[in-house]
């Protein structure tokens, strides 16, 4: 495997680019296992209706790579923890991506993106042992291909969900 | 050790006001979204109000353009502002502050303030 991007192995702030700029994803530092911070994103709107939260990633090179695969690790609150949502609240988030040969895109239009798919948390669990708790991280693996541009961007849609995004690793695997 | 406690509950009129306070100690605010949830007699919790790390809130339907939640972090201190309260408004007020852990959430509560709104 050739890693592409893993945003735990990011010194300092990702940067990503959230719209809108405010109320809706935020970076965050938690701690890790070592006790390390590392950098999140999190949103937890669950009081409004129809949320519409974006979080985009800088630009990935594919490498050549036709076929990619994103790891999505992240922690979501069940919406039945939360009293008196549960018309709003939403157990989801939704995946995209966006070819590019431009590095620097400022401006990508939600309706450029490609969804690729719904993520919702289910028993596929990484165990993290931290003192005398076991804590789980939910772990997704989506691949995207083939692709022809230089490179790529990911993003991020929440609907009303309550979701840290832990860690963002992008592959591929080579032949 | 982590400690949330509320303050400032009571018997008031239909139309007036109270401000609640709820103080931590153990932990900064920071770092958590708080969340004022009420109880009514025989009712479920209810989710008030909310307030991010960088300051957004949120309100249930029933208390917009009501109430208000603020934060003092000098204080380490979160305030619910409620003004044209109605009966109601009666129940028992909690302040809840939660974040995400790796792979967990983190969730304190406070013991409750009772408000009543009565003539």
């Known amino acids: 495997e050739v890693t592409l991007l893993d945003s735990r192995s990011v010194q300092g702030e990702l940067g990503w680019i959230a719209s809108p700029l405010e109320g809706g994803w935020e970076e965050v530092s938690i701690m890790d296992e070592k006790n390390t911070p590392i950098r999140t994103y999190q949103v937890c709107n669950v009081m409004e209706p129809s949320q519409n939260n974006w979080l985009r990633t800088d630009w990935i090179t594919r490498e050549g790579a036709q076929r990619v695969y994103i790891e999505i690790k992240f922690t979501l609150r069940d919406c039945n923890s939360l009293p008196g949502v549960m018309g709003t609240c939403k157990e989801t988030f939704n995946l995209y991506y966006y070819e590019s040969d431009n590095d620097k895109e400022r401006f990508i239009r939600e309706n450029q993106f490609v969804k690729i798919d719904t993520i919702a948390a289910d028993e596929s669990f990484t165990q993290v042992d931290i003192g005398d708790r076991i804590m789980k991280l939910n772990t997704e693996i989506r691949d995207v291909g083939p692709l022809s541009k230089k490179g790529f961007y990911l993003a991020f849609q929440d609907v009303g969900a309550c979701i840290a995004l832990v860690s963002v690793r992008v592959f591929y695997k080579k032949a | 050790q982590v400690q949330l406690q509320e303050s400032g509950g009571g018997l008031v009129q239909p139309g007036g006001s109270l401000r609640l306070s709820c103080a931590a100690s153990?932990?900064?605010?920071?770092?958590?979204?708080i969340y004022w949830v009420r109880q009514a007699p025989g009712k479920q919790r209810e989710l008030v109000a909310a307030i991010t790390r960088n300051g957004v809130t949120n309100y249930a339907d029933s208390v917009k353009g009501r109430f208000t939640i603020s934060t003092d972090d000098n204080k380490n201190t979160v305030y619910l502002q409620m003004n044209s309260l109605k009966s109601e408004d009666t129940a028992v007020y909690y302040c809840?502050?939660?974040?995400?852990?790796?792979?967990?959430?983190?969730?304190?509560w406070g013991q409750g303030t009772q408000v009543t709104v009565s003539s």
């Open positions: 809840n502050a939660w974040g995400f852990l790796l792979g967990d959430i983190e969730d304190y």
């Open positions: 153990g932990f900064t605010f920071s770092r958590y979204w």
